[in-house]
């Protein structure tokens, strides 16, 4: 089971109406450019045999492969969004830097894993794709960790 | 992928049951399941659900009325102890979770009529 | 707890017509919420979730829309087989689990 204690972030992260705007907006900018319509990221596969208590710790996984791989090198896209949207989902990620797994999270990371290979598959279809996805991240990562 | 209730009956007030949801088509070790009752002529009320662990939660106005427990292949629902109020189609759904929860499919239902 | 408040019972169209169904919950809960279809004697079939996004096999003559407190079910093209009552259902999160789901009242849509 998670450190649940850990695997927290407060409700006052996702209160920021003009944050939360653009972070949509951003996401509606790319979702635009995303061609590739009958794939879904963040979706039922995700979070299949996750219990309820490990879905924080799994959508920090998720948000750490999605600043690291795709938002930075992506980072001269879609402005003025990413430059505002960018460090606000790397502080989310810092508050998260404690939340871990106590024993094995191996179905965790098989499920993330598709997720990345699925992304890596598409090329930068699939990093576009990623970044239309961000209102999902954005409101799968609060329901799951507040 | 399917659910079925089974288990309503006519009871007498106080009189405990148990009520069986069996699934096929999919495993308990992978999703949480719900129960959500209606009483005729009424809108839906959620009673419980039981996560992929085994972890219970309860609606409020449910807690110490009903209990959640499973096997590999199907969810009971226990009514402690009946009243007349509890007189209901109650249903079993499966809840898959997107980033929000969402419940698909659901059982038919299995009538519960509590009368002395 | 959060309450959801329907549009009331009956709302009726025309085949061909369309009809909207509003759904006002007592507190933000951003886009948690699912739309369900239930024909009598029949359990509730998922129509919506995230506030508008169609389940797989429904016609896209249902849309969802809304965020927040206000949303709102359109029924296009209505046909005689969409005569039912309408759910929306919210998940609330962070707070105590025991009110984490909460149905609307339901409002019966009638074709004529």
């Known amino acids: 089971a998670p450190i649940s204690s850990h695997c927290r972030l407060d409700k006052s992260n996702f209160q920021q109406p003009y944050i939360t705007n653009r972070t949509f907006m951003l996401a509606k900018e790319a979702s635009l450019a995303d061609n590739n319509t009958d794939v879904r990221l963040i979706g039922e596969k995700l979070f299949h045999g996750v219990s309820m208590s490990e879905r924080c710790y799994l959508m920090k996984q998720v948000l750490n492969f999605t600043l690291e791989e795709v938002l930075f090198p992506q980072s001269d896209r879609f402005q003025p969004y990413m430059q505002e949207v960018v460090p606000f989902l790397a502080r989310l990620s810092n508050r998260l830097s404690t939340c871990h797994i106590e024993g094995d999270d191996l179905h965790i990371q098989r499920n993330v894993q598709k997720l990345k290979d699925t992304v890596k598959k598409l090329g930068e279809s699939g990093e576009i794709k990623a970044i239309g996805e961000l209102d999902l991240l954005f409101m799968s990562l609060r329901n799951a960790c507040i | 992928q399917s659910v079925e209730e089974s288990g309503g009956r006519l009871v007498t007030p106080g009189t405990p049951l148990t009520l069986t949801c069996t699934v096929s088509?999919?495993?308990?070790?992978?999703?949480?399941m719900i129960w959500v009752r209606q009483a005729p002529g009424e809108g839906l009320e959620w009673i419980g659900i039981?996560?992929?662990?085994?972890s219970t939660y309860y609606a409020s106005w449910a807690k110490g009325r009903f209990t959640i427990s499973r096997t590999s292949t199907t969810v009971d629902l226990k009514i402690t102890s009946p009243t007349t109020g509890d007189t209901a189609t109650y249903f079993c759904?499966?809840?898959?979770?997107?980033?929000?929860?969402?419940?698909?499919?659901w059982g038919p239902g299995t009538l519960v009529t509590v009368s002395s | 707890a959060v309450v959801l408040t329907q549009t009331a019972s009956p709302v009726s169209a025309p085949v061909g017509g369309t009809v909207t169904i509003k759904c006002q919950a007592s507190?933000?809960?951003?886009?948690?919420l699912a739309w369900y279809q239930q024909k009598p004697g029949q359990p509730p079939k998922l129509l919506i979730y995230?506030?508008?996004t169609l389940a797989s096999g429904v016609p896209s003559r249902f849309k969802g829309s809304g965020s927040g407190t206000e949303f709102t079910l359109t029924i296009s093209d209505l046909e005689c087989a969409d005569a039912a009552t309408y759910y929306c259902?919210?998940?609330?999160?962070?707070?105590?689990?025991?009110?984490?789901?909460?149905f609307g009242g339901g409002t019966e849509v009638v074709v004529k």
């Open positions: 759904a499966r809840d898959r979770f997107v980033g929000v929860d969402i419940f698909d499919p």
């Open positions: 088509g999919f495993s308990l070790s992978s999703y949480a």
């Open positions: 039981i996560d992929i662990d085994g």
């Open positions: 507190e933000d809960i951003y886009t948690n």
């Open positions: 995230w506030a508008s």
């Open positions: 259902q919210a998940c609330v999160y962070g707070n105590s689990a025991d009110s984490r789901y909460t």
